[in-house]
Amino acid sequence: SLYVPCAPSPCVNGGTCRQTGDFTFECNCLPGFEGSTCERNIDDCPNHRCQNGGVCVDGVNTYNCRCPPQWTGQFCTEDVDECLLQPNACQNGGTCANRNGGYGCVCVNGWSGDDCSE
């Protein structure tokens, strides 16, 4: 049987095969893939833009940031409002104050401690 380089196509991940000679071929890869048969997903994480301790998770021609609990947003640069998430974060009439990367309690009537419980 006669070998035809692009039948069937050796290109994976959506790559397009082009015959370059009697027994040779070339794969044109979709964005995000590389290699002679487009077999490798390019790592998009080097020098990523995830901030505030966000962890980069590689995707196909993109990446996502997995943020620490106190941060959110595309690059972990939006502060999570813990006072909204935890309405009872401060005890004994204390007032919750949202801060970048966390929150604090303003205590009243002699109460103290992180959550005004002491």
């Epitope: 080097p46 020098n47 901030q51 993109t62 595309q74 690059f75 640069t77 970048n100």
Partner: antibody, heavy 117, light 112 residues
Framework: EVQLVQSGAEVKKPGESLKISCKGS????????IHWVRQMPGKGPEWTGY????????KFNEKFKGQATISVDKSSTTAYLQWSSLKASDTAMYYC??????????WGQGTLVTVSS | DVLMTQTPVSLPVSLGGQVSISCRSS???????????LHWFLQKPGQSPQLLIY???NRFSGVPDRFSGSGSGTDFTLKISRVEPEDLGVYYC?????????FGGGTKVEIK
């Protein structure tokens, strides 16, 4: 309060070198990348590149690769944009910026660079 | 790179009037995380750009409620319901879904 304060305007001749600065304050400097954005006269802004203060790693827009370098001094919370040999086409306003709610939430006041013989 | 096209390029307005600015992207701005990273900025004469709206429709802190954003996919709109003198300047859209971040060409809002 997040503040980015840039160095003053510069007038240079083609072929000369230049280093402009952007000092960040009011936040944890190492936690955020610093971007540089170019705005040529009468045009819209263009993202040039950024630096990660913690590692010193940089990422550039392909269009600007090899034209300038970005560096950082963590001790003075300052980022720099530097050219070794300026061209007339480098004439522009250069802004540093920091991410926040979206991309480029906080901006410096800009540094006007004029390159003319 | 993603091409961001703004229309109109220039927009003469009457104070107190309504303004609508369009921004179209050359490809969908829906990120793999499900969000759409389309933002709006205003650059007043002689000033740095300032963030107005992030992720299509969220007003940044201190931005008046006369500014609103809408849209999806590749088609986005910024509306100003009652134009005030401090609203004059050049408005830019920006996408940060795809690398590199790209701005639109701008829409200049000026007095009629």
């Amino acid at each position: 309060e997040v503040q980015l304060v840039q160095s003053g305007a510069e007038v240079k001749k083609p072929g000369e070198s230049l280093k402009i600065s952007c000092k960040g304050s009011g936040y944890t400097f190492s936690n955020y990348v610093i971007h540089w954005v170019r705005q040529m006269p009468g045009k819209g802004p263009e993202w040039t590149g950024y630096i990660i203060p913690g590692s010193g790693g940089t990422k550039f827009n392909e269009k600007f690769k090899g034209q300038a370098t970005i560096s950082v001094d963590k001790s003075s919370t300052t980022a720099y944009l530097q050219w070794s040999s300026l061209k007339a086409s480098d004439t522009a306003m250069y802004y540093c910026a920091r991410d926040g709610a979206g991309s480029f939430t906080y901006w410096g006041q800009g540094t006007l660079v004029t390159v003319s013989s | 790179d993603v091409l961001m096209t703004q229309t109109p390029v220039s927009l003469p307005v009457s104070l107190g009037g309504q303004v609508s600015i369009s921004c179209r992207s050359s490809q969908s701005l829906v990120h793999s995380d499900g969000n759409t990273y389309l933002h709006w900025f205003l650059q007043k004469p002689g000033q740095s750009p300032q963030l107005l709206i992030y992720r299509i429709s969220n007003r940044f802190s201190g931005v008046p409620d006369r500014f609103s954003g809408s849209g999806s996919g590749t088609d986005f709109t910024l509306k100003i319901s009652r134009v005030e003198p401090e609203d004059l300047g050049v408005y830019y859209c920006l996408q940060s879904t795809h690398f590199p971040d790209t701005f639109g060409g701008g829409t200049k809002v000026e007095i009629k």
